[in-house]
C-alpha cells in the first residue's frame, strides 16, 4: 500500500524531534461525532505522541479512531529512530504524469507545466483555462516535485493528489505531505478541507498543504475540521508561516459543536484556532 510508504512531518514541540506520521489521519483531532452513544475508542494524539482513549458517539467522526490500542499503535506510531530519519522512498509516479499535454476546450492562454514522458522533463505549455487533464501544474516546481525523478532515479515526492481538472487545484486525497517536506506548523493545516454536515454555504479558506497555498472553499456552517479560516490572511498566518512555528503541548481546545473563533495563547505567538 503506497500510503504505508509515505510519511508526514509535523513538529509539535520544541523538545521533541519531528513527528513523522505514517498516515495523515493520525493528525486529525479525536472526533466523537454528533451521535450520543458511549463507545470506548482510541485515537492518536499528536501532542503526546501516544494512542489514547476517547468516547465515540457512534456515528460520523473521522479516520483517527480505532477499536483497540494495538490497532491505533499499528497505524499511527513508529519507533523514534524511524521517525527522525528522513527517507526518500522509491515511489511510482501518479498515473496522470503519463497523460499527454491537453490544452482543454477553452482558450484562455494560461501558462502551465506538464510532464513530458518522452523527454522525462516538465515543460511549459499553453492551457486554455478549462478542463484538459491532470497533467497540468501551476508551477514548474510543482510539476517536478510530482512527476520528475530525483537525481538517483528516485521519485522525489508522491503527493497522492487529485487535481480538479479545471481549478487545477491540487486537492490531497488523504492530505499526504511529501516525505522530504518538514512542516513545522499546526497539524490541522495538513487536513483536507471539510465542508461539514450542515446546509449553509459560507466562504472560508483552508490551507492546501500540497501546493502550500490558502484556497477558498464553501463551509456548511457546522462540523468540519480546524483547517477553516474566515480570511485568507488568517489562513496564511496560521499555516503558511508554519515553517518556523512550534506548538506547545495542549495547543488545541475542543469545544462541543460550536465553531467560534477563539484566540489560543501559544508559547511563541498568537494564532487562530477553529474549534468544532
Amino acid at each position: 500500500d503506497s500510503e504505508e510508504d509515505e510519511e508526514h512531518t509535523i513538529i509539535t514541540d520544541t523538545e521533541l524531534p519531528p513527528l513523522k506520521l505514517m498516515h495523515s489521519f493520525c493528525a486529525f483531532k479525536a472526533d466523537d461525532g454528533p451521535c450520543k452513544a458511549i463507545m470506548k475508542r482510541f485515537f492518536f494524539n499528536i501532542f503526546t505522541r501516544q494512542c489514547e482513549e476517547f468516547i465515540y458517539g457512534g456515528c460520523e467522526g473521522n479516520q483517527n479512531r480505532f477499536e483497540s490500542l494495538e490497532e491505533c499503535k499499528k497505524m499511527c506510531t513508529r519507533d523514534n529512530a524511524n521517525r527522525i530519519i528522513k527517507t526518500t522512498l522509491q515511489q511510482e509516479k501518479p498515473d496522470f504524469c503519463f497523460l499527454e499535454e491537453d490544452p482543454g476546450i477553452c482558450r484562455g492562454y494560461i501558462t502551465r507545466y506538464f510532464y513530458n514522458n518522452q523527454t522525462k522533463q516538465c515543460e511549459r505549455f499553453k492551457y486554455g483555462g478549462c478542463l484538459g487533464n491532470m497533467n497540468n501544474f501551476e508551477t514548474l516546481e510543482e510539476c517536478k516535485n510530482i512527476c520528475e525523478d530525483g537525481p538517483n532515479g528516485f521519485q522525489v515526492d508522491n503527493y497522492g493528489t487529485q487535481l480538479n481538472a479545471v481549478n487545477n487545484s491540487l486537492t490531497p486525497q488523504s492530505t499526504k505531505v511529501p516525505s522530504l517536506f518538514e512542516f513545522h506548523g499546526p497539524s490541522w493545516c495538513l487536513t483536507p478541507a471539510d465542508r461539514g454536515l450542515c446546509r449553509a454555504n459560507e466562504n472560508r479558506f483552508y490551507y492546501n498543504s500540497v501546493i502550500g497555498k490558502c484556497r477558498p472553499f464553501k463551509y456548511s456552517g457546522c462540523g468540519g475540521n480546524e483547517n477553516n479560516f474566515t480570511s485568507k490572511q488568517e489562513c496564511l498566518r496560521a499555516c503558511k508561516k508554519g515553517f518556523i512555528q512550534r506548538i506547545s503541548k495542549g495547543g488545541l481546545i475542543k469545544t462541543k459543536r460550536k465553531r467560534k473563533k477563539q484566540r489560543v495563547k501559544i508559547a511563541y505567538e498568537e494564532i487562530f484556532v477553529k474549534n468544532m
Epitope: C106, R107, G108, C130, N164, A165, N167
Partner: antibody
C-alpha cells in the same frame, strides 16, 4: 452564421452501431477556437454529454466514462463535418441526439446546436 | 461526476412577474482567476437548447437583459426580471469545471 445539420438513421437494432453525422457551415471543424460535441437527451436521463473533439496543435478528444468503451467521435476535414459512432447499442441508448459547437473563445459554452435526431433502439 | 441539482423542477409564472431558478453543484465551480464554470440554457418547446448565460453571469449574444445569472462557489441563480410568454420552456444549468460535462435536471417554466 454557424449552422449544424445532423443526419443519420432514426432506428437502430440492439447490439448494432449508431452512426450520426453533423455537417458544419459557417465555421471549420479544424478551428482552434471551437470544439465539437455530441449530447443526448432522454426522458430518463435528461441532457447527457457524450464526448467532444477539438483541434489545437493536434486533435484531442474526451468522452463520458459512461460510454467511453463504445464511443468514437471523428472529424472529417474534407467534408467539414464530424461524426458519432456508438457501438453495441441497447434500448437504453434511445434518445434525441444533438451535435453542438463549444465556443472556446468568448462564451465557453455550447452556443450552436444541431436540430436533434431522435434515435430509437429497437428490434 | 459533479452533480447539478436544480430547483424548483416546475415553475408556474405570471407574465410581467419575476422568476428565479436555483442550481446547486456538488463542488465549487469557481476557478482561481475568478471565472465561474457554469452556463445556463433554455430549451423552448420542440427546439434545441440555446445558450443564455455563460461563465455564470454573462448574457450570450441576443439574450434579452431581463435574464441575469449570479452566484459563485456551489450556488447559482438564474433570474428573469419580468417573465414574457416567449420565455416558457425548460431551463438547464451546466458545469464545465471537470469532465464529464454535466447538466441539471431542468426547470420547466410555464405560464399560470
Amino acid at each position: 452564421q454557424v449552422q449544424l445539420q445532423q443526419s443519420g438513421p432514426g432506428l437502430v437494432k440492439p447490439s448494432q452501431t449508431l452512426s450520426l453525422t453533423c455537417a458544419i457551415s459557417g465555421d471549420s471543424v479544424s478551428s482552434n477556437s471551437a470544439a465539437w460535441s455530441w449530447i443526448r437527451q432522454s426522458p430518463g436521463r435528461g441532457l447527457e454529454w457524450l464526448g467532444i473533439i477539438y483541434k489545437r496543435s493536434k486533435w484531442y478528444n474526451d468522452y463520458a466514462v459512461s460510454v467511453k468503451s463504445r464511443i468514437t467521435i471523428n472529424p472529417d476535414t474534407s467534408k467539414n463535418q464530424f461524426s458519432l459512432q456508438l457501438n453495441s447499442v441497447t434500448p437504453e441508448d434511445t434518445a434525441v441526439y444533438y451535435c453542438a459547437r463549444w465556443d472556446s473563445d468568448k462564451h465557453w459554452g455550447f452556443d450552436y446546436w444541431g436540430q436533434g435526431t431522435l434515435v430509437t433502439v429497437s428490434s | 461526476d459533479i452533480v447539478m441539482t436544480q430547483s424548483p423542477l416546475s415553475l408556474p409564472v405570471t407574465p410581467g412577474e419575476p422568476a428565479s431558478i436555483s442550481c446547486r453543484s456538488s463542488q465549487s465551480l469557481v476557478f482561481s482567476d475568478g471565472n465561474t464554470y457554469l452556463n445556463w440554457y433554455l430549451q423552448k418547446p420542440g427546439q434545441s437548447p440555446q445558450l443564455l448565460i455563460y461563465k455564470g453571469s454573462n448574457r450570450a449574444s441576443g439574450v434579452p437583459d431581463r435574464f441575469s445569472g449570479s452566484g459563485s462557489g456551489t450556488d447559482f441563480t438564474l433570474k428573469i426580471s419580468r417573465v414574457e410568454a416567449e420565455d416558457v420552456g425548460v431551463y438547464y444549468c451546466q458545469q464545465y469545471d471537470s469532465y464529464p460535462l454535466t447538466f441539471g435536471q431542468g426547470t420547466k417554466v410555464e405560464i399560470k
